[in-house]
Interface confidence: medium
């Protein structure tokens, strides 16, 4: 298991919410991506190959997410100060073999300007 800080902008704020970007290499065909808050699994998405050109995307812990050919974005809404924490992208690579797990993360700072429902 490889642990490290994300070497890219992991948090993108908009409209009182945050997009958490979890990247993976383009070569990866089948994988599971989990979003961890501290040690707690918030979201997951699994992509697997099926018959012919079919692909299966499944989530056991569902969050609004977006999949591209080299990243999974998880969206958290209605930010408040309790969202401030360490967030990790836990990537399990199934294909190509060998099986590998990588963990990258960063700290989500919450500032007044990013809160969803600021008191005026």
């Amino acid at each position: 298991e490889i642990n490290g800080s994300a070497n890219y902008e992991m948090f993108i704020f908009h409209n009182g919410g945050v997009q958490i970007l979890c990247k993976y290499p383009d070569i990866v065909q089948q994988f599971k991506m989990q979003l961890l808050k501290g040690g707690q699994i918030l979201c997951d998405l699994t992509k697997t190959k099926g018959s012919g050109n079919t692909v299966s995307i499944k989530s056991l812990k569902f969050c609004h997410s977006q999949l591209s050919n080299n990243s999974v974005s998880f969206f958290l809404y209605n930010l408040d100060r309790s969202h401030a924490n360490y967030y990790f992208c836990n990537l399990s690579i199934f294909d190509p073999p060998p099986f590998k797990v990588t963990l990258t993360g960063g700290y989500l700072h919450i500032y007044e300007s990013q809160l969803c429902c600021q008191l005026k």
């Epitope: 089948q30 099926g50 018959s51 079919t54 692909v55 299966s56 199934f94 294909d95």
Partner: antibody, heavy 124, light 108 residues
């Protein structure tokens, strides 16, 4: 024990239609993609069509594209193959088969469980 | 589409002998997405090997697979009476999935 049981085969005239069904038991059906594979009498195996776990993605061999439709009903643990505009060359034993994910990972391989097959004969 | 060619077409051997079956692909099968199946008369195919070399659950260790790219082999170290059957290789890398024409292993 995983069991796949096909039904709906029979004799049909060229240009006719048939709907094959495959009922699965002993398995969490919606965990898996499924396929139809056929075998003409005395010949080899031919992959026909595949569908992912929730029916949201399908694929077909060129020989049946536009004529056959694969679908599934997870509530009924059932897989279907609607066959239209049938031709003599579609005569075969049709198997439903389950996609498999290797132990300890999701490394994909078809097909670890097969039905016993159902015969479709297209003849005038 | 990827065309698979199997050789020999028929292999006549005695129980206890070693069988080596070949499967050649018309283009590279990436990530070793190649499987082997055994089919006996009147029965559905049975998965033996996936990922070119991984044995499926319950398959005896006398069956082994090897190869990568375009050349793959299935070996049966000591033929048992129940091993006489037709063997198909199968690529599941590119759509449409394709099977080889089969190798029949029969008793000499």
């Amino acid at each position: 024990e995983v069991q796949l049981v096909e039904s709906g085969g029979g004799v049909v005239r060229p240009g006719g239609s048939l709907r094959l069904s495959c009922v699965a038991s002993g398995v969490t059906f919606d965990d898996y993609g499924m396929s139809w594979v056929r075998q003409a009498p005395g010949k080899g195996l031919e992959w026909v069509s595949g569908i992912n776990w929730n029916g949201g993605d399908t694929d077909y061999s060129d020989s049946v594209k536009g004529r056959f439709t694969i679908s599934r009903d997870n509530a009924k643990n059932s897989l279907y193959l609607q066959m239209n505009s049938l031709r003599a060359e579609d005569t075969a034993l049709y198997y439903c088969a389950r996609d498999f994910y290797g132990s300890g990972s999701y490394y994909h391989v078809p097909f670890d469980y097969w039905g016993q097959g159902i015969l479709v004969t297209v003849s005038s | 589409e990827i065309v698979l060619t199997q050789s020999p077409g028929t292999l006549s051997l005695s129980p206890g002998e070693r069988a080596t079956l070949s499967c050649r692909a018309s283009q590279s099968v990436s990530r070793s997405y190649l499987a082997w199946y055994q089919q006996k008369r009147g029965q559905a195919p049975r998965l033996l090997i996936y990922g070119a070399s991984s044995r499926a659950t319950g398959i005896p260790d006398r069956f082994s697979g090897d190869g990568s790219g375009t050349d793959f082999t299935l070996s049966i170290s000591r033929l048992e009476p129940e091993d006489f059957a037709v063997y198909y290789c199968h690529q599941y890398d590119m759509s449409p999935f394709t099977f080889g024409p089969g190798t029949k292993v029969d008793i000499k």
